[in-house]
Amino acid sequence: LEETLLNTKLETADLKWVTFPQVDGQWEELSGLDEEQHSVRTYEVCDVQRAPGQAHWLRTGWVPRRGAVHVYATLRFTMLECLSLPRAGRSCKETFTVFYYESDADTATALTPAWMENPYIKVDTVAAEHLTRKRPGAEATGKVNVKTLRLGPLSKAGFYLAFQDQGACMALLSLHLFYKKCAQLTVNLTRFPETVPRELVVPVAGSCVVDAVPAPGPSPSLYCREDGQWAEQPVTGCSCAPGFEAAEGNTKCRACAQGTFKPLSGEGSCQPCPANSHSNTIGSAVCQCRVGYFRARTDPRGAPCTTPPSAPRSVVSRLNGSSLHLEWSAPLESGGREDLTYALRCRECRPGGSCAPCGGDLTFDPGPRDLVEPWVVVRGLRPDFTYTFEVTALNGVSSLATGPVPFEPVNVTTDREVPPAVSDIRVTRSSPSSLSLAWAVPRAPSGAVLDYEVKYHEKGAEGPSSVRFLKTSENRAELRGLKRGASYLVQVRARSEAGYGPFGQEHHSQTQLDESEGWREQLA
């Protein structure tokens, strides 16, 4: 990028540059029209018969350098060929010299600084590549010369450019003074400011564009070269903030439109709001959940919104004495989540009718809550009680919802209490083929014992076909048809109106080896 300090083509008034000395044959200002018919000013000099050592100087006005360290001067000029000038002497030249002089203010006068090299700094002696030829009575023909010179390094507030003629016949058609700067650049969402290079290369720190944030790592920088070009190098730049996406060739961050969101900074574009959410404003980093829908604390910001599940369905209960097996079907609506668990609430009502939350004597297997499978076994039910179980389905957002949690209830009434297990079995008599057993009558809480069931099998014969049962109304029994000298395992349970109690502990008994021993009482 070039920044103009002076362009005579654009000047709308007389240039009125200073000449020295005040003699005939000096530089003179002329006006004409450029290709666009705009008025332009030029300077001419043609003192080809000058006295030896006589120089004609032309000095521009003071030009503020505006921070430039190196300034470029593009000269457009024509130069008349000395051979075309019939009165040209040996002093005719086809070159001119360019100088500059620095100062902190417009302090030069008609006589100062002294019109000579030092204090003026010589830039170059300029020779014409193209010479203009002129024949008497005819128009001059020849190409315009274009020469760009480099001034500097400059350090003061401004400078003057000066042209020294020592016998040329020439026209200075235009002068363009400019400096080079790196234009403002936006790349990878990083803005690098317009920079005037002060050295061969200058590092320039970038800043993130609006609504962008720095990427991790070193802060982005580019190098501005002396020629006004940015040195190519990868830029670890910035990325659009949450709620914004890169646009216009990675030069801007654009707010996410309504109905879209972007949860994180970085690459990637705005996405439509996930299920059951919406964004009513632009620039959303997160979409708001619809009423009744939620995100769990652990859900990503871009996750769909979910709702608590509906109640479990079809609870099936199987009561077995003091234990209960409950089983149910998954809810119709999972709420859009996979972290489904179940929990149970329990109330118990005594035979007399007073109800309360279940006591601590109940056990739940695997537990009363955080169940992942749709079943539970409840143990320790008390006889002749009515239990109400409420089975609820829960998920990761159930705790966020207000209002009652839907449940599926099931009522279970336990039987009156069965007799306790029969223990203390003793063998009253044994023979090679029979065993006589007796036991204490258990204390049945709900009425008398109606009868007993004896369950026995030979030790080592564990299959169902080897187990035999015997019913007896007395608290004794005789087992017949047994094997000689064999061991038997015996269990007894009692039955009352409430039903059978549990079998007692296994009792170990043995038949006699032969008859000669006769009947023998055995105490268990």
Partner: antibody
Amino acid sequence: QVQLVESGGGLVQPGGSLRLSCAASGFTFNNAWMSWVRQAPGKGLEWVSTIEAKMPNGATFYAAPVKGRFTISRDNSKNTLYLQMNSLRAEDTAVYYCARKGMSFYNNKYAKSMFDLWGQGTLVTVSS
Amino acid sequence: DIELTQPPSVSVAPGQTARISCSGDNLGKKYVHWYQQKPGQAPVLVIYYDSKRPSGIPERFSGSNSGNTATLTISGTQAEDEADYYCSAWTTTMMHIVFGGGTKLTVL
């Protein structure tokens, strides 16, 4: 000898037309930017029009009071400058001078801003 | 556009210095030229580019221009210098020329 000689002046009625001529000699006419300047009786000088040197289609410039009524032109083969005056008004009564602008050494695209050569003038009277 | 203002008349004794002014807004930024016109004659250029003298013009004629005023100075005025003097400059449109109203110099 370097000179400019105007002709074509005279008495003309308001609304009438007149064509002034200026014959140049002693210099390269086709390298010179030429102008007309007038002077009403007892008044000061007033620039009228300028034509640049290059032909054909040289650029022309006019003072506001005459724009659209006067036309400047030149015939380089005859070394002559013209001013065609139409729709003449009483206020156009003046001595009309042909004047040369300072010339470039060799580039007729440019001229100096002063008039360095003048003709003796021709009187134009617009009256009924 | 710029307007150039001159005093209608200036009187000077022979041999004295006559100064004729020409004023206009920021005139010092423009080149000013001076013309001499004697009765019944065409104008003659006496000063151009503020202070330059054409060949054939006596050295007693000089010019300056700064600020809002340009000045034509005639040192050691002679009777033959009695004439009307006009200043001129470009207008802002550059190719248009404006003249001052003229100053009648009387040599007493």
